[in-house]
Interface confidence: medium
């Protein structure tokens, strides 16, 4: 089951999941200038067994020269709240992902793709917050989200986690602290919540609705 | 004209509980007008005009069914409905049209 | 709203255009579908120009400007069917569908 909903947004934190539980899908989105393969795979999906998770499907993006390039984010029949766009934080290995079953690594990255990935979790994924550079954690609890069902729908738990504006950063589990970007970049662009806005993923499995698709009843 | 009605949408050979799913219908000799949307689970609901506040679309995940109840109908409500599965799985950003179509039901209204 | 021709007339081997009209259209992302007399929509062209697995290779689209095209090529007699373009309008919260064109094969 799909979480209908991202993580909660905490003022000056971000989110990241240390792994990706089987089912978990991941768009292929492609920078600007550059568009899936014609007919390409929409997504990639965490799949396996007790044993192995991997990541099926491959991501690739060709040059759109001949495509309007300025085309905007088209929202599906859901979109309520506007789409947020961040650099993408680096991909985090945690030395003990791979011994969580049921469960994928980071995927790689893929030529051209988008500054941001766009992820599709699943009910029982937990995701991990840390203030962003130049804020530091206040802990009441768990800096920690998880997407439960309760009475047929889809929530995420409340993380405990306050940042405040103190030049200190809160690690995500079992991460060394970052060095400084040489470059270094304006609080602007980090002050703000990397949201992971999900989309639409294409499925390749067969699809059928039964024959008896429709029934009717007056009342 | 003013009774109700409830239509059914029995999914099945896809993850039912994954997808946005959609009514559309088409009136006699007319084309596809797009009635209502509801995402994966249900908190994501949206209406056209010409429908809002009459009918209302919900999802039973565990039946893999889609339902419309239609209230207070009208002449102009005489269509065929088609329940529609979104191509994408998830519930929001891209949209990329609806790739499973039900065969349709016939609603007729009149005195 | 999305204007389309009510009817298009061609040719068996010939190619057909279908146009799709609408305000700055090639900002959204537009959709494509067949409807046969007495059957269910089929999406035949997704995301301006993408093909769903199953759907040939004569079938195409572009997207620019105030107009989305629909081509199909080396039109068969199969072919022959009523044909809708489709978006997202963000501003309404509301999916639209084109008037629809009939294609007829001479």
């Known amino acids: 089951e799909l979480c209908d909903d991202d993580p909660p947004e905490i003022p000056h934190a971000t989110f990241k999941a240390m792994a990706y539980k089987e089912g978990t899908m991941l768009n292929c989105e492609c920078k600007r200038g550059f568009r899936r393969i014609k007919s390409g795979s929409l997504y990639m999906l965490c799949t396996g067994n007790s044993s192995h998770s991997s990541w099926d499907n491959q991501c690739q993006c060709t040059s759109s020269a001949t495509r309007n390039t300025t085309k905007q984010v088209t929202p599906q029949p859901e979109e309520q709240k506007e789409r947020k766009t961040t650099e993408m934080q680096s991909p985090m290995q945690p030395v003990d992902q791979a011994s969580l079953p049921g469960h994928c690594r980071e995927p790689p990255p893929w030529e051209n793709e988008a500054t941001e990935r766009i992820y599709h979790f699943v009910v029982g994924q937990m995701v991990y917050y840390q203030c962003v550079q130049g804020y530091r954690a206040l802990h009441r609890g768990p800096a920690e989200s998880v997407c439960k069902m309760t009475h047929g729908k889809t929530r995420w738990t409340q993380p405990q986690l306050i940042c405040t504006g103190e030049m200190e950063t809160s690690q995500f589990p079992g991460e060394e602290k970052p060095q400084a970007s040489p470059e270094g970049r304006p609080e602007s662009e980090t002050s703000c919540l990397v949201t992971t806005t999900d989309f639409q993923i294409q499925t390749e499995m067969a699809a059928t609705m039964e024959t008896s698709i429709f029934t009717t009843e007056y009342q | 004209p003013g009774g109700s009605l409830r239509l059914s949408c029995a999914a099945s050979?896809?993850?039912?509980?994954?997808?946005?799913m959609n009514w559309v219908r088409q009136a006699p000799g007319k084309g596809l007008e797009w009635v209502s949307s509801i995402s994966s689970s249900s908190s994501y609901i949206y209406y056209a005009d010409s429908v809002k506040g009459r009918f209302t679309i919900s999802r039973d995940n565990a039946k893999n069914s889609l339902y419309l109840q239609m209230n207070s109908l009208r002449a102009e409500d005489t269509a065929v409905y088609y329940c529609?599965?979104?191509?994408?799985?998830?519930?929001?950003?891209?949209?990329?049209?609806?790739?499973?179509w039900g065969q349709g039901t016939t609603v007729t209204v009149s005195s | 709203v999305l204007t389309q021709p009510p009817s298009v007339s061609v040719a068996p081997g010939q190619t057909a255009t279908i146009a799709c009209g609408g305000n700055?259209?090639?900002?959204?992302?537009v959709h494509w579908y067949q409807q046969k007399p007495g059957q269910a929509p089929v999406l035949v062209v997704y995301?301006?120009?993408d093909r769903p697995s199953g759907i040939p290779e004569r079938f195409s689209g572009s997207n620019s400007g105030n107009t989305a095209t629909l081509t199909i090529s080396r039109v068969e007699a199969g072919d022959e069917a009523d044909y809708y373009c489709q978006v997202w309008d963000s501003s309404s919260d509301h999916v639209v569908f084109g008037g629809g064109t009939k294609l007829t094969v001479l």
């Open positions: 529609a599965r979104d191509q994408l799985a998830a519930r929001r950003g891209y949209y990329y049209g609806m790739d499973v």
């Open positions: 700055n259209i090639g900002t959204k992302s």
């Open positions: 050979g896809f993850t039912f509980s994954s997808y946005s």
């Open positions: 995301d301006d120009s």
